[in-house]
């Protein structure tokens, strides 16, 4: 080397990782390392993991003058000493209504009837212990089973003869088999009763009330009834009041008032009769002018009362 470039051990500093260089001779140096580093130039990160305190299977990960613990899923905290509450972390840790119980290093599930497994996800096969009659099909359900019976068999275990085979229910009734004793049960349509739905229900004899309204007369029929209505009423149960004014029976601008079983016509001045069809002849032209004016006035009043809206005459 030329004398122009004399070797200076610490210029530039050979110490890395923040180490401080100290010249110890013409050609020698010493590095003073920061905590966590070692080597002649502080090039080595000291492994801080010996005597680490990571617990419960935690893995020590070396840092600079420190270390961290990489914890298994069931543990947390600086040294993996804090238990992870899986029940809080995973609300569905236990399935199908199972109750979650946190434990150190894990969790447990208390399963409801019919479920099993670590997370209550396995449906217990109830058919393994079922006693469906041979020839029937067992269907596993949650905490139970059901037997699907072949034609002619009934009952919980398909061990009974199906009483519905002989069509004992009449009038289109629905037939079911009692799963306990095999007897048939008929669900009767409206208007019929009895074990096999052959008896007519007398709707008119029912004690609670007359099914026909407005004093209509109840007439029983097979499987049903009908109502004979009083004048002025209609409908299956005489529930509707007939509006006799609907056909405009009143004449000469008269107002029709509907009444039960009839109507009343309110005549304009100068008219009379049930339908206001008769004109009253006064024979006085002067009076006629007065009546004409009165007729308009009356007409206005009645019209307003009957229809509740303005009607202008010009």
């Amino acid at each position: 080397a030329g004398s122009d470039n004399p070797y200076v051990p610490c210029a530039p500093s050979p110490c890395v990782n923040g180490g401080t260089c100290r010249q110890t001779g013409d050609f020698t140096f010493e590095c003073s390392c920061l905590p966590g580093f070692e080597g002649s130039t502080c090039e080595r990160n000291i492994d801080d993991c010996p005597n680490h305190r990571c617990q419960n299977g935690g893995v020590c990960v070396d840092g600079v003058n420190t270390y961290n613990c990489r914890c298994p899923p069931q543990w947390t905290g600086q040294f993996c000493t804090e238990d992870v509450d899986e029940c809080l972390l995973q609300p569905n840790a236990c399935q199908n209504g199972g109750t979650c119980t946190n434990r150190n290093g894990g969790y447990g599930c208390v399963c409801v009837n019919g479920w099993s497994g670590d997370d209550c996800s396995e449906n217990i096969d109830d058919c393994a212990f079922a006693s469906c009659t041979p020839g029937s099909t067992c269907i596993d359900r949650v905490a139970s089973f059901s037997c699907m019976c072949p034609e002619g068999k009934a009952g919980l275990l398909c061990h009974l003869d199906d009483a519905c085979i002989s069509n004992p229910c009449h009038k289109g009734a629905l037939c079911d088999t009692n799963p306990l004793n095999g007897h048939y049960i008929c669900t009767c349509p409206q208007g019929y009763k009895g074990a096999d739905c052959t008896e007519d229900v007398d709707e008119c004899a029912m004690t609670n009330s007359n099914p026909c309204e407005h004093a209509g007369k109840c007439v029983n029929t097979d499987g049903a009834f009908h109502c004979e209505c009083l004048k002025g009423y209609a409908g299956p149960r005489c529930e509707m009041d007939i509006n006799e004014c609907h056909s405009d029976p009143c004449q000469n601008d008269a107002t029709c008032l509907d009444k039960i079983g009839g109507f009343t016509c309110l005549c304009m001045p100068g008219f009379k009769g049930v339908h206001c069809e008769i004109e009253i002849n006064e024979g006085n032209s002067g009076l006629n002018d007065i009546f004409e004016a009165q007729k308009i006035e009356w007409h206005e009043n009645l019209y307003f009362q009957g229809h509740h809206h303005h009607h202008h005459h010009h």
């Epitope: 070692e38 492994d47 305190r53 617990q55």
Partner: antibody
Framework: QSVEESGGRLVTPGTPLTLTCTVS????????MSWVRQAPGKGLEWIGI??????TLFYASWAKGRFTISKTSTTVDLKITSPTTEDTATYFC??????????????WGPGTLVTVSS | AQVLTQTASSVSAAVGGTVTINCQAS???????LAWYQQKPGQPPKLLMY???TLESGVSSRFKGSGSGTQFTLTISGVQCDDAATYYC?????????????FGGGTKVEIK
């Protein structure tokens, strides 16, 4: 920051004795605490350590079964389960100097004297 | 069990002189985590040096630590009367293989 031992006294052999180390100015959740003893005219002898964070206990091989270390939020106890005359010594409580590393002890109590004699 | 051996149980030095205290470990000290303590009669030990060579805050620079692995040295230069005390080395070992901590037997320094 300070530590102070208490509970040292004259006991007869076989009578259990508990020493207490009370700390102030720092948290036991951050620092390891060790118990060290020194028999009259003898050298220092490490008994055991309770580690911060994990609360893991380590004992010297000669001390296992003879001593029990435990702690509360502000105290560290050393129970001498069945003292013998060889357990006569001054007992020191010492704080670890670096968090997470046993390393060295940079804070010591004045010590408490235990005398075991019949 | 791990053992730290301080070869000299006592040394004497003149004021202004140099004292060297050796400490040998039966097995490698973890990451050179070796400390030196000074203890005077009736007092607890006082930390001087840790990490084999790092001076504790407030301690005189006349104290110097060196060594690695199993061999460590404490050197006191420009010895003063106040340095009269017993000096202990203390090391950290792998807890999994026995004792985590061990102290040396101590070296008493007397000033002539």
């Amino acid at each position: 920051q300070s530590v102070e031992e208490s509970g040292g006294r004259l006991v007869t052999p076989g009578t259990p004795l508990t020493l207490t180390c009370t700390v102030s100015g720092f948290s036991l959740s951050s620092y390891d605490m060790s118990w060290v003893r020194q028999a009259p005219g003898k050298g220092l002898e490490w008994i055991g350590i309770i580690q911060a964070g994990s609360n893991t206990l380590f004992y010297a091989s000669w001390a296992k079964g003879r001593f029990t270390i435990s702690k509360t939020s502000t105290t560290v106890d050393l129970k001498i389960t069945s003292p013998t005359t060889e357990d006569t010594a001054t007992y020191f409580c010492a704080r670890g100097g670096v968090i997470f590393i046993i390393g060295h002890f940079n804070l010591w109590g004045p010590g408490t004297l235990v005398t075991v004699s019949s | 069990a791990q053992v730290l051996t301080q070869t000299a149980s006592s040394v004497s030095a003149a004021v202004g002189g140099t004292v060297t205290i050796n400490c040998q470990a039966s097995q490698s000290v973890v990451n050179n985590r070796l400390a030196w303590y000074q203890q005077k009669p009736g007092q607890p030990p006082k930390l001087l040096m840790y990490g084999a060579s790092t001076l504790e805050s407030g301690v005189s620079s006349r104290f110097k630590g060196s060594g690695s692995g199993t061999q460590f040295t404490l050197t006191i230069s420009g010895v003063q009367c106040d340095d009269a005390a017993t000096y202990y080395c203390q090391g950290e070992f792998l807890c999994s293989s026995g004792d985590c901590v061990a102290f040396g037997g101590g070296t008493k320094v007397e000033i002539k």
